[in-house]
């Protein structure tokens, strides 16, 4: 296992509908082919895995049907979406990239995004 | 296990107000959001509003806007709903729902609810 | 006010039939929807959460399906306990809109 630079930003405010994006950029040192991102959350101390998805180069990124994350890539770069998020999914959402394929195999974590979310009151007539 | 045990059925008259409680139990119950909904007789469901145990904040429905009061007591675990200037249309079933953060990825939305709490309003 | 219409609004099957369930929303919600079971004197049981998830006891021959402002429940093989009225739900944001409910009864 080899280790790899992975870059996001400090903090990212969600919108009044709950939705954050952020871009998570990794140091790619080969020509990897195949991708895997994984969100992880933390808070309290706790780590949970949020949502992943395998990609290959210049295909969109996989989520499963459930997840609450959808995403697109261009190069080193990944664009991350997470909807859903209210106050209570406040916290530290770290960026995991791992190159699979072709070897050797790259593992990169990044420092987090720090996404703040609150709770605003329904508009009349709106969603928000 | 997880419970949600509500108060006991209520009688009011037209006007007054009326206080259901909802204790929970089995799970930290500042983890998970609390709803409240309720059901008119031989009628639907209606969302009436949403309180943060942790917080304490509340978010409600348009319809309940200054009638409706949702507070919580993180020492004994329950929430409470408040509803003033009862009218004949507010008799119902009164049923509180935990949430979680959608992060908690092995939570599901509104899994567990009260028994629930018939509130009937006659004069 | 976020819509949340189901159709149809009552149906009658037989035993084994598959049934179909809709729910539209006025909105774009993603995959931020639940549907529930309520069977007469009883508490909403949740059946399907985020469009297709199925809920931890819930028998498989419940499905969901949909995203974005269109959704369906599905039952493949209608059984005599299924006899209930089916709600969906918005959980995308608040307000968390229920749809007016679909009456389900056995031929």
């Known amino acids: 296992c080899k280790a790899m630079h992975v870059a996001q930003p400090a903090v990212v405010l969600a919108s009044s509908r709950g939705i954050a994006s952020f871009v998570c950029e990794y140091a790619s040192p080969g020509k990897a082919t195949e991708v895997r991102v994984t969100v992880l959350r933390q808070a309290d101390s706790q780590v949970t895995e949020v949502c992943a998805a395998t990609y290959m180069m210049g295909n969109e990124l996989t989520f499963l049907d459930d997840s609450i994350c959808t995403g697109t890539s261009s190069g080193n770069q990944v664009n991350l979406t997470i909807q859903g998020l209210r106050a209570m999914d406040t916290g530290l959402y770290i960026c995991k990239v791992e190159l699979m394929y072709p070897p050797p195999y790259y593992l990169g974590i990044g420092n987090g995004t720090q996404i703040y979310v609150i709770d605003p009151e329904p508009c009349p007539d709106s969603d928000f | 296990q997880v419970q949600l045990v509500q108060s006991g059925a209520e009688v009011k008259k037209p006007g007054a107000s009326v206080k259901v409680s909802c204790k929970a139990s089995?799970?930290?119950?500042?983890?998970?959001?609390m709803h409240w909904v309720r059901q008119a007789p031989g009628q639907g469901l209606e969302w009436m509003g949403i309180?943060?145990?942790?917080?304490?904040?509340?978010i409600y429905a348009q319809k309940f806007q200054g009638r409706v009061t949702m507070t919580r007591d993180t020492s004994t675990s329950t929430v409470y709903m408040e509803l003033s200037g009862l009218i004949s249309e507010d008799t119902a079933v009164y049923y509180c729902?935990?949430?979680?953060?959608?992060?908690?990825?092995?939570?599901?939305?509104?899994?567990?609810w009260g028994q629930g709490t018939l509130v009937t309003v006659s004069s | 006010d976020i819509q949340l219409t189901q159709s149809p609004s009552s149906l009658s099957a037989s035993v084994g039939d598959r049934v179909t369930i809709t729910c539209r929303v006025s909105?774009?919600?993603?995959?931020?929807l639940n549907w529930y079971r309520q069977k007469p004197g009883e508490i909403p049981k949740l059946l399907i959460y985020?469009?297709?998830s199925l809920q931890s006891g819930v028998p498989s021959r419940f499905s969901g399906s949909g995203s974005g402002t269109d959704f369906t429940l599905t039952i493949s093989s209608l059984q005599p306990e299924d006899i209930a009225t089916y709600y969906c739900?918005?959980?995308?944001?608040?307000?968390?809109?229920f749809g007016q409910g679909t009456k389900l009864e056995i031929k």
């Open positions: 309180v943060n145990p942790s917080g304490g904040t509340s």
């Open positions: 985020r469009a297709s």
């Open positions: 089995g799970y930290t119950f500042t983890s998970y959001y």
């Open positions: 729902a935990r949430d979680p953060p959608i992060t908690l990825v092995r939570g599901a939305p509104f899994d567990y």
């Open positions: 739900q918005r959980t995308y944001s608040a307000p968390y809109t």
């Open positions: 909105q774009d919600i993603s995959r931020l």
